[in-house]
């Protein structure tokens, strides 16, 4: 993929590690959970596919004073070698859809934790 | 503290090849980026590419696409940077740095660099 | 590529006078999602490059404020309001926006 005289290319598989972070501070975000996440924010649903991390990024950015998912985001960061910025827009997001931060970081979590089981970390 | 502890210098033939090492401490290594950049003696930085360690993807500057291949070992918090088929071009110091979600993926610490000579 | 040409190459100050080095870019370099990458680095001698600015005009943690970055689209400039002796060193501009990301030829600050 040749992007503005750039060459973007996929990594090796990673080893579980940073998968299994990630799905810790997702179970550690729903788990913790009191009043409403990040106060009911509703953010762009994603199809949960190839791309997902940089979708979930673009998602979740646009939640701002939000300390619960500060974490996440820059755990997402980490698994997108794209710079994303709030206001950004994916083709990968459900456009007509908006969820709960809550329901979305559970979705996102369940989706994880199936990979991590299949042994897809990438 | 955060640190990018780059291995020593190296001192390598023409042709060759050399894995040159960046690890990481105090900061969760998945969570950030890592830069690649390349500074020849007396002479300003060229950007080689980053690597999102998590995933372990890249985005490579196309000259060093057949030169430079940025890859992340996990488990112990090491970046590496594998140079091939070297020439006198490639004798400089190579420095790893960290991109930052938080202050907008600019480089905001530095390893302190690994000088790679090619010499007969 | 974006070329990023720096001017002046050399600059020589006395200590406690005000410093401006150019940064511009052969391109507009605002990212396909809004924002501006522009940073500002500084080496001294026989040192790795530190971080002083990002996103044109943030000043880094620790960054005194005598340090200040400006401007838009493809000219930038970095000001240095009372230079101290340990703000000599090589300047570099750099552009996070588009791939290869670039950095300046670079500006000596050094006594005059």
């Known amino acids: 993929l040749t992007c503005l005289g750039g060459f973007a290319s996929p990594g090796p598989v990673p080893p579980s590690t940073a998968l299994r972070e990630l799905i810790e501070e997702l179970v550690n975000i729903t788990q913790n959970q009191k009043a409403p996440l990040c106060n009911g924010s509703m953010v762009w649903s994603i199809n949960l596919t190839a791309g997902m991390y940089c979708a979930a990024l673009e998602s979740l950015i646009n939640v701002s004073g939000c300390s619960a998912i500060e974490k996440t985001q820059r755990m997402l960061s980490g698994f997108c070698p794209h710079k994303v910025s709030a206001g950004q827009f994916s083709s990968l997001h459900v456009r007509d859809t908006k969820i709960e931060v809550a329901q979305f970081v559970k979705d996102l979590l369940l989706h994880l934790k199936k990979l991590f089981r299949e042994g897809q970390f990438n | 503290q955060v640190q990018l502890q780059q291995s020593g210098d190296d001192l390598v033939k023409p042709g060759a090849s050399v894995k040159l090492s960046c690890k990481a401490s105090?900061?969760?290594?998945?969570?950030?980026?890592i830069n690649w950049i390349k500074q020849r003696p007396g002479q300003g930085l060229e950007w080689i590419g980053h690597?999102?360690?998590?995933?372990?993807?890249?985005y490579d500057n196309e000259m060093f696409k057949d030169k430079a291949k940025l890859t992340v070992d996990t488990s112990s918090s090491t970046a590496y940077i594998h140079l091939s088929s070297l020439s006198s071009e490639d004798s400089a110091v190579y420095f790893c740095?960290?991109?930052?979600?938080?202050?907008?993926?600019?480089?905001?610490?530095w390893g302190q660099g690994t000088s790679v000579t090619v010499s007969s | 590529d974006v070329l990023m040409t720096q001017t002046p190459l050399s600059l020589p100050v006395s200590l406690g006078d005000q410093a401006s080095i150019s940064c511009r870019s052969s391109?507009?370099?605002?990212?396909?999602?809004?924002?501006?990458?522009l940073e500002w680095y500084l080496q001294r001698p026989g040192q790795s490059p530190k971080l002083l600015i990002y996103k044109v005009s943030n000043r880094f943690s620790g960054v005194p404020d005598r340090f200040s970055g400006s401007g838009s689209g493809t000219d930038f400039t970095l000001k240095i309001s009372r230079v101290e002796a340990e703000d000599l060193g090589v300047y570099y501009c750099?552009?996070?926006?588009?791939?290869?990301?670039?950095f300046g030829g670079g500006t000596k600050l050094e006594i005059k």
């Open positions: 391109q507009n370099i605002v990212h396909s999602n809004g924002k501006t990458y």
């Open positions: 740095a960290r991109g930052s979600f938080t202050f907008f993926y600019a480089m905001d610490y």
């Open positions: 750099f552009q996070g926006s588009h791939v290869p990301y670039t």
């Open positions: 690597i999102a360690p998590g995933s372990g993807e890249t």
């Open positions: 105090g900061y969760t290594f998945t969570s950030y980026w």
